[in-house]
């Protein structure tokens, strides 16, 4: 069943699926200029048994050249505003993600794919949580929250995680430190869904090594 | 929670047109598709169009091009159909409708009378 | 345009019974289908997304199966609230479409 609200906000910190169930939807949406074709899919879908799972349907994007445009649509300010990452590159796959059965991994970009994703979270789904770059962990403790069914209703559980202002940077499981952190910090409002950025930043030394940041937006 | 409250029923004139609102909350308005459905006794439902109110696309059923115009105000997260020269045939209850995860408006009654 | 046909446009059953609503696509659409439940006077409320995902507060006694072109809703240990007209809808491709509906009688 699809969760009802969002994971719960935590100041100063942001979330990620490690893995999607069975059941999580995520929206086919297409980067400005483009939009899903008529004949393509609305969303994707994580589907499959116990031992495979994997992302129904394909989204596909086309230019929106021949665009119905009328005086009232009028893009809100923050969609005015340009990215600083404007392409979705390959996403990060955690090592453990393959071994969990009943779970898809974070789903291949699309051609002119938003950079931003919208899921839809389904009962037993669990997101995991870190302080965003220039805060820390104030005390180890469970930094993730799972989608329950209570009484009828879903609800998230609550993530033992307060985040410090300290320049240090808590970690999602086996990731490296974020070389750069996202801009501002989301605002919430009800609904059901999730949106999550896939930045890869690329740093200027020498090295080059490449890390995702997921940033989460509350709808 | 997300709700879509549209506009009260309508009583119009044939060959008049009218103007019927789909106010969202709850959710980004500029993120999904929200649709329109015609309801009438014996005829089911029928999918009018869609309409992407981030960047104003729109999706129309031939059956209902000319006779209906999807636009949205992001500003006010309202959704519109306007439908035109209307006559007894457009009789119905009209329905807003997010696309997917999909969720209804409660319907607006238009009838069309002399 | 895809037609969805309902063969049945009235089902009559008894409160505990289990009862079948069938749903024929008139070429393939995938698992690209959704079932509503309307009550008389209300909007139509979602059961099921991509053939047979329930949404967040349908109970389990709604299921929902299929894939290709034929698909069923299932209602095990039917109740008196269960009253009302069912439509699938495919959503494979443009225009989207509905089947015409079919009434459950509780007897």
């Known amino acids: 069943e699809l969760c009802d609200d969002d994971p719960p906000e935590i100041p100063h910190a942001t979330f990620k699926a490690m893995a999607y169930k069975e059941g999580t939807m995520l929206n086919c949406e297409c980067k400005r200029g483009f939009r899903r074709i008529k004949s393509g899919s609305l969303y994707m879908l994580c589907t499959g048994n116990s031992s495979h799972s994997s992302w129904d349907n394909q989204c596909q994007c086309t230019s929106s050249a021949t665009r119905n445009t009328t005086k009232q649509v009028t893009p809100q300010p923050e969609e005015q505003k340009e990215r600083k990452t404007t392409e979705m590159q390959s996403p990060m796959q955690p090592v453990d993600q393959a071994s969990l059965p009943g779970h898809c991994r974070e789903p291949p970009p699309w051609e002119n794919e938003a950079t931003e994703r919208i899921y839809h979270f389904v009962v037993g789904q669990m997101v995991y949580y870190q302080c965003v770059q220039g805060y820390r962990a104030l005390h180890r403790g469970p930094a993730e929250s799972v989608c329950k069914m209570t009484h009828g209703k879903t609800r998230w559980t609550q993530p033992q995680l307060i985040c410090t202002g300290e320049m240090e940077t808590s970690q999602f499981p086996g990731e490296e430190k974020p070389q750069a952190s996202p801009e501002g910090r989301p605002e919430s409002e009800t609904s059901c869904l999730v949106t999550t950025t896939d930045f890869q930043i690329q740093t200027e030394m020498a090295a080059t090594m490449e890390t995702s940041i997921f940033t989460t937006e509350y709808q | 929670q997300i709700q879509l409250q549209q506009s009260g029923a309508e009583l119009v004139r044939p060959g008049t047109s009218v103007k019927i609102s789909c106010k969202a909350s709850?959710?980004?308005?500029?993120?999904?598709?929200l649709g329109w459905v015609k309801q009438r006794p014996g005829h089911g439902l029928e999918w009018i169009g869609d309409?992407?109110?981030?960047?104003?696309?729109?999706n129309y059923n031939e059956k209902f091009k000319g006779k209906a115009t999807l636009t949205a105000d992001t500003s006010s997260s309202t959704a519109y159909m306007q439908l035109s020269s209307l006559t007894s045939e457009d009789s119905a209850v009209y329905f807003c409708?997010?696309?997917?995860?999909?969720?209804w408006g409660q319907g607006t009654t238009l009838t069309v009378s002399a | 345009d895809i037609l969805l046909t309902q063969s049945q446009k009235f089902m009559s059953t008894s409160v505990g019974d289990r009862v079948s609503v069938t749903c024929k696509a008139s070429?393939?659409?995938?698992?690209?289908v959704a079932w509503y439940q309307q009550k008389p006077g209300q909007s139509p409320k979602a059961l099921i997304y991509?053939?047979?995902y329930r949404y967040s507060g349908v109970p389990d006694r709604f299921t929902g199966s299929g894939s290709g072109t034929d698909f069923t809703l299932t209602i095990s240990n039917v109740q008196s609230e269960d009253l009302a007209e069912y439509f699938c809808?495919?959503?494979?491709?443009?225009?989207?479409?509905f089947g015409g509906g079919t009434k459950l009688e509780i007897k």
């Open positions: 409708a997010r696309v997917t995860p999909a969720s």
């Open positions: 709850g959710y980004t308005f500029t993120n999904y598709w």
């Open positions: 309409i992407y109110p981030g960047g104003g696309y729109t």
């Open positions: 070429q393939n659409v995938g698992t690209n």
């Open positions: 991509s053939a047979s």
């Open positions: 809808q495919q959503y494979n491709s443009y225009p989207l479409t």
